[in-house]
Interface confidence: low
């Protein structure tokens, strides 16, 4: 056959769905590779052909559309289940051509099976609600393109395996369930079961997000540096280790970059020749507020080490904060024979 | 407590109409789809048809499309099933039966609380 | 329309008996299936739901399995209340077809 542009297994998105619910998926070429839309296409003449690979199988088939009550069809750059079942998992193809031009992209899709309480394989998008914050709400996604504005759906909404219904602070409100005020006990899987008639049958889609609750921007402090402090003096003889800690807390900001680091007379520990290393650990609050420490260590210490200026610095959205760690050379204990000695005065 | 009443049923001739109803108490009737189920005598359980809690969306089995009408009152928590052209195949105890919480299809509750239902007779 | 077929349509079996009934769809239902039960001259009541999760207040010796076709209903302990029809029902969408019934009885 003629050269046709091959982008290859799209595996950036792996599109999940669940079993038995409808499924609409766009040919990605138009989203991700190709600098046109789907209408621009069709009307220069090009024609989209779908074809799919079943799961452990090599052999490229083409997708049937004349399937009872047309379970699998073709609208514009949609592939549409209604619905899936489970051996629609595989790679699907979609090819863009006509005489002179083809481009082809595949992706995998996987039909996946869930339980009576929602769970399942399947990824879960979060949602992150800032604590206390006053009323907050979550929106079923990806249901837009399956029912025309005229039907009006019915919206179910469960907190793991429970129907939400004359809870304190959750309120299913059609499409969103409002939270109103968010607290550490509504953490959780949260579903929306979207349940349309379509040409005499009923369809379910089901919706699973993972909700958790976040330090709210209220309570949101520049970084605070705990170690090393004016407490703690790292006093050290040539040739120990010298180990020094910097500890900072952060608190939970949406989006915000934090970083811990160390100078070492204003460098950076890379642009200095001696042999020190730094590790780091993170932990995290329920509300996500954020620790990091990062151990600067000097295997074998000098006495030019112990002289220089260690700084510890930290930055996030909120601001930039520096302390220097108080480092000293242990004095060395008087050496008695040498000072009696001197004291009876031998020549 | 939870409990499902039907009443109405009776005997009538071949292609006359009837209405039954179902008195719903004891749970938030207007939060739940609804749906009649009929019996044959000495035969299997047949599903008739369902209405959403908001009226929005009703389905009924092939056999009695277009001479049967589903319908609610939520303000006196009842639901009807008016049944015109009535055959003798028809005939049948008639059940009402709570669906799922908000309509949501049957979507795991399935069908909880039937009536004790009421016998339906068409002959002539 | 989605057919729902039961096995066996009667049987006969000892107090203590393990009982096994079938059902099966046309086409795959995912986990959307319903076990009944009833006594002559009662109401159905439902058993089971989403195929294998027991109704509050149901005994334990009843119990579910299955998805997408092919669906079992287990009594593990045959006990003289049990004796009734079973039947299954498909609720995935519109018609909520019932499976013909399984009428169970004391040997």
């Known amino acids: 056959s003629e050269r046709c542009d091959d982008w290859g297994l799209d595996t950036m998105r792996q599109i999940q769905v669940f079993e038995d619910e409808p499924a609409r998926i766009k040919c990605p070429l138009f989203e991700h590779f190709l600098k046109f839309n789907y209408s621009t296409a069709h009307s220069a003449g090009l024609t989209l052909i779908w074809y799919w690979t079943r799961q452990d199988r090599d052999l490229e088939e083409p997708i049937n559309f004349r399937l009872p009550e047309n379970r699998i069809s073709k609208e514009k750059d949609v592939l549409w289940f209604r619905p899936t079942l489970l051996n629609d998992t595989g790679n699907y193809t979609c090819m863009l051509r006509n005489t002179t031009y083809c481009s082809k992209v595949a992706f995998p899709l996987e039909v996946v099976q869930k339980d009576s309480c929602f769970n399942s394989p399947m990824k879960l998008p979060v949602h992150k609600l800032y604590i206390e914050y006053g009323i907050q709400r979550i929106t079923c996604p990806n249901v837009d393109g399956y029912f025309p504005s005229s039907v009006k759906p019915t919206i179910t909404w469960y907190m793991g395996c429970y129907k939400i219904q004359n809870f304190n602070n959750v309120i299913p409100e059609g499409m969103n369930l409002s939270f109103l005020i968010a607290l550490i006990s509504n953490n959780g899987n949260y579903t929306c079961v979207v349940t349309y008639p379509e040409n005499g049958r009923t369809f379910h889609l089901t919706r699973t997000l993972t909700v958790k609750v976040v330090g709210s921007p209220k309570n949101a402090v520049p970084p605070v540096i705990h170690s090393p402090n004016d407490h703690v003096v790292y006093e050290k003889e040539p040739g120990e280790e010298l180990l020094i800690p910097c500890t900072v807390y952060f608190s939970f900001l949406m989006d915000s970059r934090n970083e811990v680091w160390w100078t070492i007379d204003g460098k950076k520990p890379d642009d200095i020749t001696i042999d020190v290393t730094i590790n780091e650990s993170i932990s995290h609050s329920r509300t996500e507020d954020e620790t990091r420490t990062q151990i600067l260590s000097i295997k074998k210490v000098t006495s030019e080490d112990l002289k220089r200026s260690y700084v510890c610095h930290a930055r996030s959205a909120k601001g930039e904060v520096a302390k220097a760690a108080k480092v000293k050379q242990k004095v060395p204990a008087p050496r008695y024979t040498v000072e009696l000695a001197c004291g009876f005065g031998a020549t | 407590q939870v409990q499902l009443v039907e009443s109405g049923g009776g005997v009538v001739q071949p292609g006359r109409s009837l209405r039954i109803s179902c008195a719903a108490s004891g749970f938030t009737f207007r939060s739940y789809g609804m749906h009649w189920v009929r019996q044959a005598p000495g035969k299997g359980l047949e599903w008739v048809a369902i209405i959403w809690h908001d009226e929005s969306y009703k389905y009924y089995v092939d056999s009695v499309k277009g001479r049967f009408t589903i319908s609610r009152d939520n303000s006196k928590n009842t639901l009807y099933l008016q049944m015109n052209s009535l055959r003798a195949e028809d005939t049948a105890v008639y059940y009402c039966?709570?669906?799922?919480?908000?309509?949501?299809?049957?979507?795991?509750?399935?069908?909880?609380?039937w009536g004790q239902g009421t016998m339906v007779t068409v002959s002539s | 329309d989605i057919q729902m077929t039961q096995s066996p349509s009667s049987l006969s079996a000892s107090v203590g008996d393990r009982v096994i009934i079938t059902c099966r769809a046309s086409q795959g239902i995912s986990n959307y299936l319903a076990w009944f039960q009833q006594k002559p001259g009662k109401a159905p009541n439902l058993l089971i739901y989403a195929a294998s999760t027991l109704r509050s207040g149901v005994p334990s010796r009843f119990s579910g399995s299955g998805s997408g076709t092919d669906f079992t209903l287990t009594i593990s302990s045959l006990q003289p209340e049990d004796v009734a029809t079973y039947y299954c029902q498909k609720y995935n969408s519109a018609p909520y077809t019932f499976g013909q019934g399984t009428k169970v009885e004391i040997k």
């Open positions: 039966a709570r669906g799922d919480y908000y309509g949501s299809g049957s979507y795991y509750d399935a069908f909880d609380i």
